[in-house]
Interface confidence: medium
Amino acid sequence: ESGYAQNGDLEDAELDDYSFSCYSQLEVNGSQHSLTCAFEDPDVNTTNLEFEICGALVEVKCLNFRKLQEIYFIETKKFLLIGKSNICVKVGEKSLTCKKIDLTTIVKPEAPFDLSVIYREGANDFVVTFNTSHLQKKYVKVLMHDVAYRQEKDENKWTHVNLSSTKLTLLQRKLQPAAMYEIKVRSIPDHYFKGFWSEWSPSYYFRTPEINNSSGEMD
């Protein structure tokens, strides 16, 4: 059902838009998985509204979400990771709206970390390295990474490079000399799992050397 009304206290509930979106994070805390859902309309009155997931769970039929301010959250080992689960918004025992979702198709990886850039003078390049917790995971191991960098003064002029490894080389001649650059990286599932981009890693800032006038190369 799309609406719910009882004794006039929620008679306009059917006019509300209860559409929601969710993402899963697998092995986010040891062997525990998490599922996070939120309403797409930030103005929805969430008082008395609950989320429940049923199906494709191990040992239990359904699980209830915990509410954390405006998001709904589950952390559990009980996700089966096969088939579709039914996720419902409920008031009491009444379902307002439901979605069938395969949790392996809404995976949001953890953000990469330890991003750094090292200048190699002899090679005239910059080696970008970063780390990801997914290298140690059993499930979401294969990721595609998006490295984005820009000259600090160019607000929206990001250059993006997609790669599957955690190491990237930027050629010095492709960058402006004596400039401050900002670089960051995010990840998305590749291969079996599908889903969304992770949050961006914290940005790393680096400066390119000045041009050596005699040779036309950067210092």
Epitope: G55, A56, K61, I82, G83, Y192
Partner: antibody, heavy 121, light 109 residues
């Protein structure tokens, strides 16, 4: 009524190929993983292969890996098993089975009546 | 892959008897075990899932128990229609596979 009907079995020579089909009705086919299970004459049940609802999760028994291919067509509510390089030991009754993961995990709650594959020269 | 070993392989019993069949997994599988009944010339039928949950329409004389590596199927009072072969089944979701026990044939004494 939930129903699975297998077809495509028959007598085939060793080394040849055969394709089994399973027509599903009475349930939302693309909500469910599907499996092939076989039973050699007078023997027990042997899982052959399984495929997730969206075809991204696929598994095979070691005995058929590299020779058999499972695939599905959700638009036609159909499951298939392409069997290549057939051997005498593949002779069996082949069942198509529906997976009911809402039970908690891979549980085969509906089975077809099976189709017989005989590999002999 | 996990191996399932059923015991006994065959069993003779009389109508009204209480019968227990065991299934041992080579490694822990929590409660992820199902039991099936198969009669000659018929497809298998799901009896128990999640080690102890009774499938809809299955008589209450059937029950399942156990977790980890040791599981049992119990028929509290055998009926004539219960003489069949019984299989336990376990699974893995990633990579995907299913495995069956070798079966226990229950015959009339």
């Amino acid at each position: 009524e939930v129903q699975l009907v297998e077809s495509g079995g028959g007598l085939v020579q060793p080394g040849r190929s055969l394709r089994l089909s399973c027509a599903a009705s009475g349930f939302t086919f693309d909500d469910h993983a599907m499996h092939w299970v076989r039973q050699a004459p007078g023997k027990g049940l042997e899982w052959v292969s399984g495929i997730s609802w969206n075809s991204r999760g696929i598994g095979y028994a070691d005995s058929v890996k590299g020779r058999f291919t499972i695939f599905r067509d959700n638009a036609k509510n159909s499951l298939y098993l392409q069997m290549n390089s057939l051997r005498a030991e593949d002779t069996a009754l082949y069942y198509c089975a529906k997976d009911e993961y809402s039970r908690g995990y891979y549980v085969l709650d509906v089975w077809g009546q099976g189709t017989t594959v005989t590999v002999s020269s | 892959a996990i191996q399932l070993t059923q015991s006994p392989s065959s069993l003779s019993a009389s109508v009204g008897d209480r019968v227990t069949i065991t299934c041992r997994a080579s490694q822990g599988i929590s409660s992820a075990l199902a039991w099936y009944q198969q009669k000659p010339g018929k497809a298998p039928k799901l009896l128990i899932y999640d080690a102890s949950s009774l499938e809809s329409g299955v008589p209450s004389r059937f029950s399942g128990s156990g977790s980890g590596t040791d599981f049992t199927l119990t028929i509290s009072s055998l009926q004539p229609e219960d003489f069949a072969t019984y299989y336990c089944q376990a699974f893995n979701s990633y990579p995907l596979w299913i495995t069956f026990g070798q079966g226990t044939r229950l015959e009339i004494k």
